[in-house]
Interface confidence: low
């Protein structure tokens, strides 16, 4: 089943997030992703846990998953590079770089997103945008078109409270509020964008969604700048 959902959001403006990617397994949406360079998509390492021998591809330039759109193109994956320290049983280092079979053809609806290199926390309360094609309600309805929601960043101390994530949020992770509006699982790999810059990637650890005491967890890309650069080099 696809990993991910946007809860309490709304349909995104078509093609207004040209960096948005759908990581697909055997032709079906699996996870979100974000185009960070012409030939590279950043996603979450846990997304490929269930991939086994399936065919992994990346869809770019899409708003609707099913409808013909002039900008849509499905790319094969040449190489999948999970972070070397990612492990199945933790949310740490949950990053994956996918090298496309060729450079993406850039256009109005396909364009890399600048990512944060300055390793400094986003100010609590900052409104950030998260988008994805995951299910939109607890009944499991899957959207055909891209959904998004604006979420305020939550400070790490609050997120680490015993009632919340109980110390699991390291300096390499960040949180966003989850009161009825939330990302979940397989929006996993999708971007958390603050001020037009990629700040976080939705983690794919399982957690209850839309519960304010279980904030959304995002991997801070700035904390992994050296690794990203080394892979893209």
């Amino acid at each position: 089943p696809p990993r991910g959902r946007i809860l309490g959001g709304r349909e995104a403006e078509a093609h207004a997030r040209p960096y948005m990617a759908s990581v697909q397994l055997n032709g079906a949406h699996l996870c979100g992703g974000v185009l960070v360079a012409e030939q590279w998509v950043l996603s979450a390492a846990h997304c490929l846990e269930d991939a086994a021998d399936g065919k992994v591809q990346v869809l770019l330039g899409a708003h609707s998953l099913s409808q013909p759109e002039p900008s849509k193109r499905l790319y094969d994956v040449l190489r999948a590079v999970p972070h070397p320290d990612s492990q199945p049983d933790t949310i740490d280092h949950d990053l994956l770089l996918l090298q496309l079979s060729e450079k993406a053809t850039l256009g109005p609806a396909v364009r890399p997103l600048p990512w944060q290199r300055v390793d400094r926390d986003v100010a609590p309360g900052t409104l950030c945008d998260v988008a994805g094609w995951g299910i939109v309600n607890h009944a499991g309805r899957r959207p055909d078109s891209l959904q998004h929601v604006l979420l305020p960043v939550l400070d790490r101390a609050t997120c680490n409270r015993r009632t919340h994530h109980d110390g699991a949020i390291t300096e390499r992770l960040m949180c966003a509020e989850s009161n009825r509006r939330d990302s979940c699982k397989g929006d996993s790999g999708g971007p958390l964008v603050c001020g037009g810059v990629l700040e976080g990637v939705v983690t794919s650890g399982s957690r209850v969604c839309g519960n304010r005491k279980k904030p959304g967890i995002y991997t801070r890309v700035a904390s992994y700048a050296a690794w990203i650069d080394s892979v893209l080099a």
Epitope: Q67, P70, S71, R73, T105, L106, P108
Partner: antibody, heavy 122, light 107 residues
């Protein structure tokens, strides 16, 4: 057979308004992005507006932004261009164009109508 | 805006000849370039997209090449029906922009 038939072109005074229509047939209109492109008397082509298949995404060049509005009625298979605050430099032949769904994607235009003529002059 | 420059407004050729029409982009557009043919009194027709892919039904005497900033449309074994205006277009970013056109005419 794909057909795009424009109408609504006319002689209008500077500052005036005009609404162009494009009747589409021979394909599933709601499945395609559409644009208006104009050709000025020296034959140059200028793209003036784009609409996604459900009109949730529209875009304009600076030359017409705030003056032109593209819209569509998928039930009527019709694309529109509402033009206001018209200037003499808007004088042109206006084409309705379709954006194909190519396996490789892209904002190219695979079908063009025959055009409708707009003249802005006092 | 990305400016597409077609340096030759006119090009003279003879039936059976080979002719190359060039187009230069003001910045890197990858291969997001299309070519259109406009015969006298008609609307433009798509010939080539992604710089080198022929559109359905386009004769193989039309060939596109190039990437980055320099693009070429080559017509080999020119036929009388090829005498027309040719326009390049970039679609790597908004606004979508066209070259000013090159008119292919008989010597």
């Amino acid at each position: 057979e794909v057909q795009l038939v424009e109408s609504g072109g006319d002689l209008v005074k500077p500052g005036g308004s005009l609404k162009l229509s494009c009747a589409a047939s021979g394909f599933t209109f709601s499945g395609y992005g559409m644009s208006w492109v104009r050709q000025i008397p020296d034959k140059r082509l200028e793209w003036v507006a784009i609409s996604s298949r459900d009109n949730s995404f529209t875009y304009y060049p600076d030359s017409v932004k705030g003056r032109f509005t593209i819209s569509r009625d998928n039930a009527k298979n019709t694309l529109y261009l509402q033009m206001s605050s018209l200037k003499s430099e808007d004088t042109a032949l206006y084409f309705c164009t379709r954006h194909p769904y190519l396996p490789t994607g892209g904002y190219v235009m695979d079908y063009w109508g025959q055009g409708t003529s707009v003249t802005v002059s006092s | 805006d990305i400016v597409m420059t077609q340096s030759h407004k006119f090009m003279s050729t003879s039936v059976g000849d080979r002719v190359s029409i060039t187009c230069k982009a003001s910045q890197d557009v990858g291969t997001a370039v299309a070519w259109y043919q406009q015969r006298p009194g008609q609307s433009p027709k798509l010939l080539i997209y992604w710089a080198s892919t022929r559109h359905t039904g386009v004769p193989d005497r039309f060939t596109g090449s190039g990437s980055g900033t320099d693009f070429t449309l080559t017509v080999s074994n020119v036929q009388s029906e090829d005498l027309a205006d040719y326009f390049c277009q970039q679609y790597t970013s908004y606004p979508l922009t066209f070259g000013a056109g090159t008119k292919l005419e008989l010597k």
